[in-house]
């Protein structure tokens, strides 16, 4: 169940895809990645108010229990629902290789 | 990549499975669920310090960028890695039915 996409906190405040520019140094990859030198990292950032983009039944339960016990149960969290692959040119024992990482760039977000 | 399971914040402080007891009223289910009357909800709660139970490359990136830009990029979040099914006896238009929910109870946790 993918619930409401209307953010009650105001435009852009709720869970959505953001792009953060990062260098290989920022990522701690400079010693093993040759390319790309800079990555447009897409990630899921934002609040998860009641039933906003609830990923599943568990997220709905979490919302209900957070409302009841906010000190014990955290609100649902904005995380990737799916990913885009990314290809890196990386150093290997024998030289250099292309490697696809399927879980590197967020493609879509939900609350869980 | 499922990284270190050692919690640097002290025992039980990092992302792990917790059990929260909840009634049908707590969950907002009283009008459509007959049984169970009380649910032992297993959910993922706790901090996600650097590389602790990192779910994938995305989580590792998030850790690195959170360290660099804590106001922009949140730390990884403790969420279910897998679920246990749960069977509810629920009301239907025609009476009562058994229904299995595959995404209700967290079974295992990771940081993402």
């Amino acid at each position: 169940a993918r619930n409401g996409d209307h953010c009650p906190l105001g435009p852009g405040r709720c869970c959505r895809l953001h792009t953060v520019r990062a260098s290989l140094e920022d990522l701690g990859w400079a010693d093993w990645v040759l390319s790309p030198r800079e990555v447009q990292v897409t990630m899921c950032i934002g609040a998860c108010p009641s039933q906003f983009r609830a990923a599943n039944m568990h997220a709905q339960i979490k919302t209900s229990l957070h409302r009841l016990k906010p000190d014990t149960v955290p609100a649902p969290c904005c995380v990737p629902a799916s990913y885009n692959p990314m290809v890196l040119i990386q150093k290997t024992d024998t030289g250099v290789s292309l490697q696809t990482y399927d879980d590197l760039l967020a493609k879509d977000c939900h609350c869980i | 990549a499922r990284n270190g399971d050692h919690c640097p914040l002290g025992p039980g402080r990092c992302c792990r499975l917790h059990t929260v007891r909840a009634s049908l009223e707590d969950l907002g289910w009283a009008d459509w669920v007959l049984s169970p009357r009380e649910v032992q909800v297993t959910m993922c709660i706790g901090a996600c310090p650097s590389q602790f139970r990192a779910a994938n490359m995305h989580a590792q990136i998030k850790t690195s960028l959170h360290r660099l830009k804590p106001d922009t990029v949140p730390a990884p979040c403790c969420v279910p890695a897998s679920y246990n099914p749960m069977v509810l006896i629920q009301k239907t238009d025609t009476g009562v039915s058994l229904q299995t929910y595959d995404d209700l109870l967290a079974k295992d946790c990771h940081c993402i």
Epitope: L34, S35, P36, R37, N84, P85, M86, V87, L88, I89, T92, D93, T94, G95, V96, S97, L98, Q99, T100, L105 | -
Partner: antibody
């Protein structure tokens, strides 16, 4: 000695299929990326695609769907399967070790001598 | 799709002179670029990789420079064996990976 030897070329009719082989010796295929390149008579070089050491494949956009790169590590051989061949696919087909824009350790320039594919009726 | 554009198509140079060949990428390819020399009936020979690193066994008169989208191959003093066709190859990676050669520059004797 480290070597690459292409085979499987020849005359094929338009619409036909052909599988080229690149037999390698002197190194383990699973440790290296392998690239296929072609060159039409009197023309420039054309990048076809790569199979990585981990088995992922990457293709030029024009090659996607018609050309497939695979490998058999036990036979130390890389393959280029070509389908729905057209006259403009007539070329010498080369295999080469590595991704070419960066050097592998050791031999920096390992290419086969090429195999000629002629598509004609 | 990545497109590599070489210029000029033909370069007429006298032996002993300097030759400068250009290659432009349609995408930012960082230093994912190599230069090859090819003579008739032979496979290409790697001269420069990573945009500026001289391949083993290649004379020091060959040098490469550039990054991003603009690249140059320089032959400081042309020898008779340097008259050949030169190709650049770029590889672009992001959500996938794709390579492309430039159309080639023929270096001929003036």
């Amino acid at each position: 000695e480290v070597q690459l030897l292409e085979s499987g070329g020849g005359l094929v009719q338009p619409g036909g299929s052909l599988r080229l082989s690149c037999a390698v010796s002197g190194f383990s295929l699973s440790s290296y990326d392998m690239t296929w390149v072609r060159q039409a008579p009197g023309k420039g070089l054309e990048w076809i695609g790569i199979i990585s050491g981990s088995g992922n494949t990457y293709y030029a956009s024009w090659a996607k769907g018609r050309f497939t790169i695979s490998r058999d590590n036990s036979k130390n051989t890389v393959y280029l399967q070509m389908n729905s061949l057209r006259a403009e696919d007539t070329a010498v087909y080369f295999c080469a070790r590595g991704i070419l824009v960066y050097a592998d350790y050791g031999d920096h320039n390992l290419w086969g001598q090429g195999t000629l594919v002629t598509v004609s009726s | 799709d990545i497109v590599m554009t070489q210029s000029p198509a033909t370069l007429s140079v006298s032996p002993g002179e300097r030759a400068t060949l250009s290659c432009q990428a349609s995408e930012d390819i960082y230093t994912n670029l190599a230069w090859f020399q090819q003579k008739p009936g032979q496979p290409p020979r790697l001269l420069i990789y990573a945009a500026s690193t001289l391949a083993s066994g290649i004379p020091a008169r060959f040098s490469g420079s550039g990054s991003g989208t603009e690249f140059t191959l320089t032959i400081s003093s042309l020898q008779s064996e340097d008259f050949a066709v030169y190709f650049c190859l770029g590889v672009y990676t992001y959500i996938s990976a794709e390579g492309a050669f430039g159309q080639g520059t023929k270096v001929e004797i003036k």
